[in-house]
């Protein structure tokens, strides 16, 4: 369970892949599409508001009562819209929603090598946001083999301005 209804911190950042392609968001036919693309030099990177929450592990392996906490994140590129996992379609979508946000909007943050991060679905452990055919998709990761899979690694670049939502 999320231990608090308020995030412990928020940051405004641009999101890019391990291979330095930008994650961009475009309004098309009254819905948002998510793209993974090489940005032209003069084009500004899209901003994402990342809100970080603490969450206790759901159950204990050892039964000793202290199970550690996870860092959860929600990602919002524009006001009232959040990235959400669609586990049935194995897709990542932008949906307009009100708080409290659904579980599909929460991702467990993993730090990775090369100072990248990965986003694991709260609703489907072992499934991560990844890059597939120039789009974001949900990718099942075999923990024993693919912990460093480049297609689930992302870089966050801080945008130093006030953490107000960008409209």
């Amino acid at each position: 369970s999320i231990t608090g209804i308020s995030p412990i911190t928020e940051s405004l950042a641009s999101l890019s892949t391990y291979n330095d392609q930008s994650i961009t968001f475009a309004l098309e036919d009254e819905s948002y599409e998510i793209y993974v693309e090489d940005l032209k030099k003069d084009k500004k990177k899209d901003k994402v508001l990342l809100s970080y929450y603490e969450s206790q592990h759901p159950s204990s392996e050892s039964g000793d009562g202290v199970d550690g906490k996870m860092l959860m994140v929600t990602l919002s590129p524009t006001k009232d819209f959040w990235l959400q996992a669609n586990n049935k379609e194995h897709s990542v979508e932008l949906h307009k929603c009100e708080k409290p946000l659904p579980d599909q909007a929460f991702f467990v943050l993993h730090n990775r090598s090369f100072n990248c991060v990965s986003f694991e679905c709260k609703t489907d452990p072992g499934v991560f946001i990844g890059v597939k055919d120039n789009h974001l998709a949900l990718i099942k990761v075999d923990y024993s083999e693919n912990l460093g899979s480049e297609n689930i690694l992302f870089k966050l670049s801080e945008i130093l301005e006030h953490h107000h939502h960008h409209h």
Epitope: I8, S113, Y143
Partner: antibody, heavy 122, light 107 residues
Framework: EVQLVESGGNLEQPGGSLRLSCTAS????????MNWVRRAPGKGLEWVSG????????YYADSVKGRFTISRDNSKNTLYLQMNSLSAEDTAAYYC???????????????WGHGTTVTVSS | DIQMTQSPSSVSASVGDRVTITCRAS??????LAWYQQKPGKAPKLLIY???SLQSGVPSRFSGSGSGTDFTLTISSLQPEDFAIYYC?????????FGQGTRLEIK
């Protein structure tokens, strides 16, 4: 009670080797990313190495890369630091420390052992 | 590597004083900064994480603020047990790096 207990510190000659151990209790060790941090006499804290909960990912400070190896045995709730090619600059109190978050180092280190002393001198 | 610079390196203060320690990162680290207290012969103790979150069990006289590159630890009213060395630590990226420490001494 959440606890980390280090052992293995000793007086060692330059060029020698030591293996430090850290035994954990009171929390789910296999979920927790762990670290070694040292403090040399009269100096500040220096992060030495880190390892993910599964042991699949390891990280090192440049000052120890190629000489030190971090590892863990989750069945024994124990963290290790194998230290080779020791020099006087490695003289320090060595602490093991648990990451606050199970999958992220963003939260700092919330549980620390009491430390074990390594002295490298001829 | 990210360099962390603390100031002052030492400070003398009296019980009841308000004390502020600053920490500057050589590049932006979002809010991923932790503060520790260490007393002689003891292990470091986590006080603040994520720049401003108070670790469980730590007295509320300790507070943290800042984001990006500039951070502050404030002790609102010094108590006798607060005299120690304080370290900042960037938790944004490996290698993890600490500030050089600030020694808080009794005036």
């Amino acid at each position: 009670e959440v606890q980390l207990v280090e052992s293995g510190g000793n007086l060692e000659q330059p060029g020698g080797s030591l293996r430090l151990s850290c035994t954990a209790s009171g929390f789910t060790f296999s979920r927790s990313a762990m670290n070694w941090v040292r403090r040399a006499p009269g100096k500040g804290l220096e992060w030495v190495s880190g390892i993910s909960g599964s042991g699949g990912r390891t990280y090192y400070a440049d000052s120890v890369k190629g000489r030190f190896t971090i590892s863990r045995d989750n069945s024994k709730n124990t963290l290790y630091l194998q230290m080779n090619s020791l020099s006087a600059e490695d003289t320090a109190a060595y602490y093991c420390a648990k990451d606050s978050y199970t999958t992220s180092w963003y939260g700092g280190m919330d549980v620390w052992g009491h430390g074990t002393t390594v002295t490298v001198s001829s | 590597d990210i360099q962390m610079t603390q100031s002052p390196s030492s400070v003398s203060a009296s019980v009841g004083d308000r004390v502020t320690i600053t920490c500057r990162a050589s590049q932006g680290i979002f809010s991923w900064l932790a503060w520790y207290q260490q007393k002689p012969g003891k292990a470091p103790k986590l006080l603040i994480y994520a720049a401003s979150s108070l670790q469980s069990g730590v007295p509320s006289r300790f507070s943290g603020s800042g984001s990006g590159t500039d951070f502050t630890l404030t002790i609102s009213s010094l108590q006798p047990e607060d005299f120690a060395i304080y370290y900042c630590q960037q938790a944004n990226s490996v290698p993890i790096t600490f500030g050089q420490g600030t020694r808080l001494e009794i005036k």
